[in-house]
């Protein structure tokens, strides 16, 4: 999150979370402006000459939905600046001299989860937009999974799922004759060990996708888990 | 930041061969899409050929197709273009540069966020 400091007792932190593609969706803390104040942050770049966009502030959230031609790239950098008027006048107070979007991902959900039920496993396969294709190998995504009956919190987890979009269940990991449910995240992943920090993409989770149901696949032969029996 | 340095432009007889390098400096090399445009004495800068960023698709403009072959190494933050069976009128300044394909497609300029300076290519008949 980015922190601008308001003038007086005001202070307000600005949080600006982007899908790494053309949207940055911000949210403040601060206390509602006066009526017809309409503030709004501006987002100009310190690389693109000319590259400014508003997100005008609704309540507490904004969103800036960027023109094709200003999709994000991994070494755009902007200034951030919240606009307000006052008495008539335009009041300007910087958030943040350097807004870097890759340091602030929280990527769209995967979409298209799809199951497909074979003898003795379920194989899950997912989308994701072709505009983050080049940065496969960036995704980290996690999965969860239970009987449909249980709560998600009762679900067990699978993550490092890095670089693929495709996952099998093995049959002993799902309670057989039972509908299940599955369900998946994304974040941004950068897992070289030669990456320097300020190289490096950082956020947070994606939302959850929707839920895929699928029957559990009967088991086959006598249940050896891989590991071996203790 | 991404620096483009476009090397390998000269004199060459028509029917000759040059290969041009593209080195980008800073990050992100294998994210990006690399392009070459080129631009002719009193004409406007046109589509060459494109390679995406792992180097697995390449798209060439009909003019230069069968003759012209893009490469690129990501490990030496490099693109190529090699130009074999030159002609007279592909004399021009060639211009590397580097986008994140996303809306647009790789032959347009507008795809591309990062030029380099150009480098002559002259071919004599």
């Known amino acids: 999150s980015v922190t601008g400091e308001g003038q007086g007792p005001r202070s307000r932190t600005f949080t600006c979370l982007t899908n790494n593609i053309l949207r940055i969706d911000c949210h403040w803390s601060a206390p509602e402006l006066g009526q017809g104040s309409s503030p709004w942050l501006l987002f100009t770049s310190n690389q693109a000459p000319g590259g400014t966009h508003k997100c005008i502030l609704r309540g507490s959230e904004c969103t800036v939905v960027l023109p094709p031609e200003a999709v994000l790239v991994p070494s755009d950098n902007f200034t951030i600046t919240f606009h307000h008027c006052m008495s008539g006048r335009e009041q300007v107070s910087l958030v943040d001299p350097e807004y870097l979007p890759r340091r602030h991902v929280k990527l769209d959900p995967p979409s298209d989860l799809q199951s497909n039920i074979s003898s003795g496993h379920c194989i899950l396969t997912w989308s994701i937009s072709p505009a983050l294709e080049p940065m496969t190998t960036l995704l980290s995504y996690e999965l969860a999974f239970k009987k449909q009956e249980e709560a998600w919190e009762q679900a067990q987890h699978r993550d490092h799922i890095v670089g693929v979009t495709w996952l099998i269940l093995e049959a002993f990991e799902l309670d057989p004759g039972f509908i299940h449910e599955a369900r998946l995240r994304v974040q941004m992943a950068t897992l070289e060990d030669d990456v320097v920090e300020e190289e490096r993409y950082t956020g947070q989770w994606s939302e959850w996708s929707q839920p895929v149901c699928f029957q559990a696949p009967q088991r086959q032969g006598p249940l050896i888990p891989p590991w071996g029996w203790p | 930041q991404v620096q483009l340095v476009e090397s390998g432009g000269g004199l060459v007889q028509a029917g000759g061969s040059l290969r041009l390098s593209c080195a980008a400096s800073?990050?992100?090399?294998?994210?990006?899409?690399m392009g070459w445009f080129r631009q002719a004495p009193g004409k406007e800068r046109e589509f060459v050929a494109a390679i995406s960023n792992e180097g697995g698709s390449t798209y060439y403009a009909d003019s230069v197709k069968g003759r012209f072959t893009i490469s690129r190494d990501n490990a030496k933050n490099t693109v190529y273009l090699q130009m074999n069976s030159l002609k007279p009128e592909d004399t021009a300044v060639y211009y590397c540069?580097?986008?994140?394909?996303?809306?647009?497609?790789?032959?347009?300029?507008?795809?591309?966020?990062?030029w380099g300076q150009g480098t002559q290519v002259t071919v004599s008949s």
């Open positions: 800073g990050r992100w090399f294998r994210f990006y899409g």
């Open positions: 540069a580097a986008g994140r394909w996303y809306y647009y497609g790789p032959e347009y300029q507008i795809t591309y966020r990062y």
